[in-house]
């Protein structure tokens, strides 16, 4: 049967993002409609047809446009994505002979990790704190010269959709750690980034 090929996209917050649909059919559609999937019913965003050209719904006027004006291949572009744009979008190709054929492309918004790494001496111990804030939630690991060092992790979700993961390394004999390198590893979207800290006696 006739189908629509789509691809999900993951883009960084406050950057442009494009979603594309391709109608796998010998013929073009009569009209293409893009809708945002919502809990109750989908919301019309924009249509393209030979008769009327591009018609953008008021709520999306300054947010999107159709950047590939095709009736077989259609691309919408968000100029500057926000967290509200995350979700799934339907492209509907109204075809002669086969009615409305739809595809779904999902947009995921990510925020690159912001990482802070610092340490603090107390009388008999050393705390090294590594905090990473990102979307989706990052993971924090430690690479230390010796084993058996305890750590504690706290996760905090923010109203803006990001998540902070804070891990504290508790070192009982801080003298042993002076001059040595501690590595905080942040895992985000499959990429591990190392943040290095050498402990100096203050």
């Amino acid at each position: 049967q006739v189908q629509v090929v789509t691809q999900d996209e993951r883009e960084q917050l406050y950057t442009p993002a494009s979603l594309k649909c391709s109608l796998q059919n010998a013929q073009e559609a009569l009209i293409v409609t893009w809708q945002k999937k919502k809990a109750v019913s989908p919301e019309n965003m924009v249509t393209f047809s030979e008769n009327h050209g591009v018609v953008i719904q008021p709520a999306y006027k300054d947010k999107i446009n159709i950047t590939q004006l095709g009736l077989q291949n259609s691309t919408i572009t968000f100029w500057n994505i926000t967290l509200e744009d995350e979700g799934c979008y339907m492209c509907l190709f109204n075809t002669f002979g086969f009615g409305k054929i739809s595809g779904t492309a999902c947009l995921t918004v990510y925020v690159q990790p912001i990482v802070s790494l610092h340490y603090k001496f107390s009388e008999d111990h050393l705390n090294i704190t590594c905090s990473a804030t990102a979307r989706p939630a990052p993971m924090v690991f430690w690479k230390v010269p010796r084993s058996g060092i305890e750590n504690s992790t706290v996760t905090l979700s923010h109203p803006n959709g990001t998540t902070s993961v804070t891990s504290i390394l508790h070192i009982k004999d801080p003298k042993n750690q002076v001059g040595k390198e501690v590595i905080c590893q942040v895992l985000h979207l499959g990429t591990v980034t190392d943040f290095k800290q050498t402990v100096n006696k203050g």
Partner: antibody
Framework: QVQLVQSGAEVKKPGASVKVSCKAS????????ILWVRQAPGQRLEWMGH????????NYNLKFKGRVTITRDTSASTAYMELSSLRSEDTAVYYC??????????WGQGTLVTVSS | DIQMTQSPSSLSASVGDRVTITCKAS??????LSWFQQKPGKAPKSLIY???RLVDGVPSRFSGSGSGTDFSLTISSLQPEDFATYYC?????????FGQGTKLEIK
């Protein structure tokens, strides 16, 4: 030049099946939908269904309750319409046509199918 | 199914006359309507598609208009070869359906 040439007239008994062919020439067969329309004596035209030869996807008028099957042979640039369980009211002229989207431009000459006991 | 009702069912006119045939859909069909001309014993011939677009090779005296539920086909100046039966077709929704036809006869 573009041509759609249909098979010849048929006389069938009630309950039998008929298969009408529509041979296309003068264009790329897979670029156009082939549709089938019939016209009983003194009646309006009636849409039966159509096929996209590129993928072989077809769509039918449910009025025919599964009695109609539209197929194609791309190597022979030919579309077929088979109607089964024939009854007297299926006596009609059967036409094939091609369309690019909703743009119909060429039609076959028609095939008279007579259903009679 | 969407019902397509043409009017009039038959019409007598003279060469040079301006004639209009109407087609009414039982529900909104946007602009998804075609017009066909058929002569006795012949296959239909396409005239208009998408309500108002002229098929290549069709004389400019033929024009179509309308959207939603009400459509019309106008022949601005009848020629002898225009006497035939005219059908409308909706293709907004399956099954695609034709009007009952309008027979245009010489007065």
């Amino acid at each position: 030049q573009v041509q759609l040439v249909q098979s010849g007239a048929e006389v069938k008994k009630p309950g039998a099946s008929v298969k009408v062919s529509c041979k296309a020439s003068g264009y790329s067969f897979t670029d156009y939908i082939i549709l089938w329309v019939r016209q009983a004596p003194g009646q309006r035209l009636e849409w039966m269904g159509h096929i996209d030869p590129y993928y072989g996807s077809s769509n039918y008028n449910l009025k025919f309750k599964g009695r109609v099957t539209i197929t194609r042979d791309t190597s022979a640039s030919t579309a077929y319409m088979e109607l089964s369980s024939l009854r007297s009211e299926d006596t009609a002229v059967y036409y094939c046509a091609r369309s690019k989207r909703d743009y119909f431009d060429y039609w076959g000459q028609g095939t008279l199918v007579t259903v009679s006991s | 199914d969407i019902q397509m009702t043409q009017s009039p069912s038959s019409l007598s006119a003279s060469v040079g006359d301006r004639v209009t045939i109407t087609c009414k859909a039982s529900q909104d069909i946007n602009s998804y309507l075609s017009w066909f001309q058929q002569k006795p014993g012949k296959a239909p011939k396409s005239l208009i598609y998408r309500a108002n677009r002229l098929v290549d090779g069709v004389p400019s005296r033929f024009s179509g208009s309308g959207s939603g539920t009400d459509f019309s086909l106008t022949i601005s100046s009848l020629q002898p070869e225009d006497f035939a039966t005219y059908y409308c077709l909706q293709y907004d929704e399956f099954p695609y359906t034709f009007g009952q036809g309008t027979k245009l006869e010489i007065k």
